[in-house]
């Protein structure tokens, strides 16, 4: 089995490599993954307490 | 259902091996890197390798390069760790976890979403 | 090695209570950072990741915050369940690595 680079930091690694649409680069790993999407519901009502949280959609298999 | 389930651990001496087992079911374990962490008695949470069985990329803690061995089976759906030279710091409760990722801008962002129930591994005379 | 140093290590603190954890990394790791929360004798359990988004099925009242070396976990209104540890950990570079931990008891 082959390791990813250990000593690679962000700043010096190379750029991300292109992924297919349903990949997207991660940086741990140094390689693409699957990837699901991220959405930002609309902002609340003005007068609510706090900004709706951020959350995501699960990856598809 | 996404579920994790290790097996495998028990009693060794120092200097003995076991061998990890992370059977995995409701995704495949070639679309993400699967980790394994453990946890000492009483202590946090430590990190110890992590595979991407897609392409066979593994990365270890210094603690344990040299010793241990992470692998993955894509037809199995299953990752190892295989644990040589055993020491009584090596005792923990070991995790095995997925790690799932969102796309930012192209990037991962992502954390371990599944775990699995942790089995204990005790290294004792 | 990218450290995460997290503060306090422990905390008292009762139901309804604002409760602020904070991480600090030893280096840039612009927003990857993720939070858990571990119960005794339990897996862990992914709250936030990417900083500030929150995990699917995580209680609203759990937040995150930061970017660059310092990051947050907020808990708006601490309910009976939240009583637990906390961990955060960087994802940035291999190897990732765990703060220390903050376990939260009832006061």
């Known amino acids: 089995m082959r390791r990813g680079p250990r000593s690679l930091r962000g700043r010096d690694a190379p750029a991300p490599t292109p992924c297919v649409p349903a990949e997207c680069f991660d940086l741990l790993v140094r390689h693409c993954v699957a990837c699901g999407l991220l959405r930002t519901p609309r902002p609340k009502p003005a007068g609510a307490s706090s900004p709706a949280p951020r959350t995501a959609l699960q990856p598809q298999e | 259902e996404v579920q994790l389930v290790e097996s495998g651990g028990g009693l060794v001496q120092p200097g003995g091996s076991l061998r990890l087992s992370c059977a995995a079911s409701?995704?495949?374990?070639?679309?993400?890197?699967i980790h394994w962490v453990r946890q000492a008695p009483g202590k946090g949470l430590e990190w110890v390798a992590w595979v991407l069985p897609s392409v066979g990329f593994t990365d270890y803690a210094d603690s344990v390069k040299g010793r241990f061995t992470i692998s993955a089976d894509t037809s199995k759906n299953t990752a190892y760790l295989q644990m040589n030279s055993l020491r009584a710091e090596d005792t923990a409760v070991y995790y095995c976890?997925?790690?799932?990722?969102?796309?930012?801008?192209?990037?991962?962002?992502?954390?371990?979403?599944?775990w699995g129930q942790g089995t204990l591994v005790t290294v004792s005379s | 090695d990218i450290q995460m140093t997290q503060s306090p290590s422990s905390l008292s603190a009762s139901v309804g209570d604002r409760v602020t954890i904070t991480c600090r990394a030893s280096e840039d790791i612009s927003s990857a950072v993720a939070w858990y929360q571990q119960k005794p004798g339990k897996a862990p359990k992914l709250l936030i990741f990417?900083?500030?988004y929150l995990f699917s099925g995580v209680p609203s009242r759990f937040s995150g915050s930061g970017s660059g070396t310092d990051f947050t976990l907020t808990i708006s209104s601490l309910q009976p369940e939240d009583f637990a540890t906390y961990y955060c950990q960087q994802s940035q570079v291999s190897p990732p690595t765990f703060g220390q931990g903050t376990k939260v008891e009832i006061k």
């Open positions: 990417a900083a500030s």
């Open positions: 409701g995704f495949t374990i070639s679309s993400s890197s």
């Open positions: 976890a997925r790690r799932v990722c969102y796309n930012r801008l192209g990037v991962c962002a992502g954390g371990m979403d599944y």
